[in-house]
Amino acid sequence: TPEVWVQVRMEATELSSFTIRCGFLGSGSISLVTVSWGGPNGAGGTTLAVLHPERGIRQWAPARQARWETQSSISLILEGSGASSPCANTTFCCKFASFPEGSWEACGSLPPSSDPGLSA
């Protein structure tokens, strides 16, 4: 069964800046990746970025840079300033859609006790 992993890291240089990394562990080719915060995209979460392997990347504030790391993993950097900036207990979710197999999603957040730069 395919799985999704999520890592959330707070940048040491900017304490309110986050890096989210997500990956898909499965055999299907990825058609779309959706990154959201505040919960899964279908349960009240807000979309931060949508990554399509052919048609490009769309991102919304406070997302600063979304990119493909491999064919089955992505990363997203969030800006740390402003009213819409994330806090330490924010939940981030990644949903990987593979055709015709379907979609798999997982969520993660920064561990409460973690130091800046530590992976979740």
Partner: antibody, heavy 120, light 107 residues
Amino acid sequence: EVQLVESGGGLVQPGGSLRLSCAASGFTFSSYHMSWVRQAPGKGLELVSAINSNVISTYYLDTVKGRFTISRDNAKNSLYLQMNSLRAEDTAVYYCARHEDYYGFAMDYWGQGTLVTVSS
Amino acid sequence: DIVMTQSPDSLAVSLGERATINCKASQSVSNDVAWYQQKPGQPPKLLIYYVSHRFTGVPDRFSGSGSGTDFTLTISSLQAEDVAVYFCHQAYRSPWTFGQGTKLEIK
């Protein structure tokens, strides 16, 4: 304008074969996943077979596995369904449909359908 | 397989009144739910995708809502041209499955 035009339907005896075709125009065919959906007279919708844009993955309804083969020719902007060992229960209107990745794989455009009648 | 169960099977509503069609999934389908309208002798047409997003050209009297396993299609003010069969559809997990359809008529 997106257009999907099916052809190849008709009357065939049980055990016979048909090859359905779907000619696509008005969009970059090679970038989209495609499906065949059927509807028996007075009945609901049933996904028969699907193929992803890069022809890596396919799906078949359990009752047609081993009898039907989906294929596509991206150079000819065409989708096909080879149907062998046809049964009376395969009688239906067969629709060609396009899936939109950005819409959660919803089928955003459909052809008018081609009627397949399996009867002796 | 994920089973999509629509209710009611048929519905009669007066012109200008609200019509509500429900769809229940046998397990969570995230937000990968679409609604289609099919008129006699025509192919289905996409109305709603991602639970609540209207497809291009769809009148704003059509709206979708729900999450997880329970979803609703609402027509706020029924028009004569809305007479059709409506299907919900999940594309969350293969095999994609449809509801059995709800026939909407004018009372």
